[in-house]
């Protein structure tokens, strides 16, 4: 069974107890008392059911990573010490760890280190000190999710704001505006049209249109609304039909333009 010609080489695994916060690296050191010609160094974790996982190994000057690449073995320059590190430790990495050195044939022998315990604690937000440390970084997936949700919300809010602005502003802009001096006075048509007219422009207020602004609709010619413009203090003459853009330039209406109706 045991090989008498090979000394039982003590194997150390330190620290015996290690506590790290989640997300930090946890590093044990496995040390051989001597360096045999041919050996394998395994890194194990004991599970609660007394079963084990081999996390990683070192054999014949090369690292054999396990299934989880977070577990890394590094040989130090002195040749007999090995760093066994868990990158970005998780809460469920807590447990019992050890290393095992196997001397290879012709004198096969297994040597196990003492056990060491790792405790991974939840990351706590510490109160700010003299130089406050940055908050813990979220994990990649969570960070992406937060950014994505925030982007969508901002986009929706901007869209709602744009819709509200357009709904509030655009109907007036498309319909145009004018003032009417007296809605009670009917338009008088007579043969004696005055050669010069003065127009007072302002906002035409329709009480019956007071309701929630509707989203802007494209202006089609058949949807044009008309208002009667009364020219106060002068005998009325045939008015002029104009488009919203023609309201920009104040020109007197000419008799051939038809009835005194202005589009809104």
């Amino acid at each position: 069974l045991d090989s008498p010609d090979r000394p039982w080489s003590p194997l150390t695994f330190s620290p015996a107890q290690l506590t790290v916060q989640e997300g930090e690296n946890a590093t044990f050191t496995c040390s051989l008392a001597d360096i045999p010609d041919s050996f394998v160094l395994n890194w194990y974790r004991l599970s609660p059911r007394n079963q084990t996982d081999k996390l990683a190994a070192f054999q014949e000057d090369r690292i054999e990573p396990g299934r989880d690449r977070r577990f890394r073995v590094t040989r130090l320059p002195n040749g007999r010490d090995f760093h066994m590190s868990i990158v970005a430790a998780r809460l469920n990495d807590s447990g019992i760890y050890l290393c095992g050195a196997i001397y290879l044939p012709p004198n096969t022998q297994i040597n196990e280190s003492p056990r060491a315990e790792l405790s991974v604690t939840e990351r706590t937000l510490e109160p700010p000190t003299q130089s406050p440390s940055p908050p813990p970084r979220l994990s990649g997936q969570l960070q992406g999710l937060v950014i994505g949700v925030t982007s969508v919300l901002v986009g929706v809010l901007l869209l709602l704001l744009l819709t509200w602005v357009l709904a509030a502003v655009f109907p007036r802009a498309t319909r145009g505006a004018c003032v009417c001096g007296s809605e009670d006075e009917p338009l008088k048509e007579g043969p004696d049209a005055a050669p010069v007219f003065t127009l007072d422009y302002g906002e035409l207020d329709f009480q019956w249109r007071e309701k929630t602004p509707e989203p802007p609709a494209p202006c089609a010619p058949e949807q044009t609304e008309y208002a009667t413009i009364v020219f106060p203090g002068r005998p009325a003459s045939p008015g002029r039909r104009a488009s919203a853009s023609s309201l920009q330039g104040a020109q007197p209406p000419s008799p051939e333009d038809g009835p005194g109706l202005w589009p809104l």
């Epitope: 069974l1 084990t52 050890l98 196997i102 044939p105 096969t108 022998q109």
Partner: nanobody
Framework: QVTLRESGGGLVQPGGSLRLSCAAS????????MTWFRQAPGKDREGISC????????IYADSVKGRFTASRDNAKDTMYLQMNNLNPEDTAVYYC????????????????????WGPGTQVTVKP
């Protein structure tokens, strides 16, 4: 001092059953895959079953598949081999051995990954 000790062998008639045990001491039993080997008179030693430490998965040689079942109890540092429907060709000395791997990834061939052997237990199948 690492020791392995087999037990449960004996004389049995064809079609009969036996249950072998392999008790380990001096090592963390749960760290290592365990293999059952056998050696019939005048023949080479052959691997017949391996059971992983990590998940208890097993592999079997074709000659025993469907008749033999390996199991382990890490809390008791013991491995078992339930042998059913035995026939005279199963007559051999049965050995248990520790592997220095946790899994049976290397098959059943006799290999230098076997670290320790037990002394063996004799199984004889005859009418």
């Amino acid at each position: 001092q690492v020791t392995l000790r087999e037990s449960g062998g004996g004389l049995v008639q064809p079609g009969g059953s036996l249950r072998l045990s392999c008790a380990a001491s001096g090592l963390t039993f749960g760290l290592y895959a365990m293999t059952w080997f056998r050696q019939a008179p005048g023949k080479d030693r052959e691997g017949i079953s391996c059971i992983s430490s990590s998940d208890g998965s097993t592999i079997y040689a074709d000659s025993v598949k469907g008749r033999f079942t390996a199991s382990r109890d890490n809390a008791k540092d013991t491995m078992y081999l339930q042998m059913n429907n035995l026939n005279p060709e199963d007559t051999a000395v049965y050995y248990c051995a520790t592997d220095y791997e946790t899994r049976c990834d290397y098959g059943l061939r006799l290999r230098d990954r076997t670290a320790y052997w037990g002394p063996g237990t004799q199984v004889t199948v005859k009418p």
